[in-house]
Interface confidence: medium
Amino acid sequence: PEPPTACREKQYLINSQCCSLCQPGQKLVSDCTEFTETECLPCGESEFLDTWNRETHCHQHKYCDPNLGLRVQQKGTSETDTICTCEEGWHCTSEACESCVLHRSCSPGFGVKQIATGVSDTICEPCPVGFFSNVSSAFEKCHPWTSCETKDLVVQQAGTNKTDVVCGPQDRLRA
């Protein structure tokens, strides 16, 4: 019979012969022959192959390096790679999440509008009139000025976007 020029799905052509590909999670040990099937072996502990293949080496699972702020989101299997994500308080620098950066701080006069997530950075907003922030923080919102009236006090010093109002006792003297 004529040697094949193309093979079925999940097969590959070698030495004018169609051999079965190894299934995901296994690597090729030896090609098939006229008399033997393709020989495959499972990937090792920290290895994977995610397709039908004829690879002689499995790929190493990705390492989620804690020194880069990374942690394991999903542990790899013999058929899937490990998925990394950022530790709390950090976010990915790219879609591939190869490293993480600390969330950006909002300077005094600005508060956190939205705390950062694992994929997006802090969103800061200027403190509007009536609110202030005297800290540099990636987490703190603008705080409302103290209400002197509710404490039966009067404003001695006006507040700003960076400072609270200063309250003082009411002047008891009447003209």
């Epitope: 950066v101 950006r104 923080s137 987490f139």
Partner: nanobody, 121 residues
Framework: EVQLLESGGGLVQPGGSLRLSCSAS????????MQWVRQAPGKGLEWVST????????YYADSVKGRFTISRDNSKNTLYLQMNSLRAEDTAVYYC??????????????RGRGTLVTVSS
């Protein structure tokens, strides 16, 4: 000049507890988020925990979550790390660090000299 001085480290058995302190000076302590980082022998810096300026928000690395507690006393300019159920892999030099003002990949603006925690039987 920013100064951070850690204390409270020592030798402890697995399962034991320690409380680390960090005394801060040279800046308005209450005006910054703070954090603890650590460096195990022969390894790089690893982030441990962050606390917001007011102490309301706290964050932990997965490796210490449920065992370590970060806190602060702004009136005393002091940061704390309560470490319970200690494991051999917690052995490291622990540093307190002022949270950077900008993006930073393990580049902590200011950190102290560290205190060594050894967990061994």
């Amino acid at each position: 000049e920013v100064q951070l001085l850690e204390s409270g480290g020592g030798l402890v058995q697995p399962g034991g507890s320690l409380r680390l302190s960090c005394s801060a000076s040279g800046f308005t302590f209450s005006g910054y988020d703070m954090q603890w980082v650590r460096q195990a022998p022969g390894k790089g810096l690893e982030w441990v925990s962050t606390i917001s300026a007011s102490g309301v928000y706290t964050y932990y690395a997965d490796s210490v979550k449920g065992r370590f507690t970060i806190s602060r006393d702004n009136s005393k300019n002091t940061l704390y790390l309560q470490m319970n159920s200690l494991r051999a892999e917690d052995t490291a030099v622990y540093y307190c660090a002022k949270y950077p003002n900008r993006f930073a990949l393990n580049s902590f603006d200011y950190r102290g000299r560290g205190t060594l925690v050894t967990v061994s039987s």
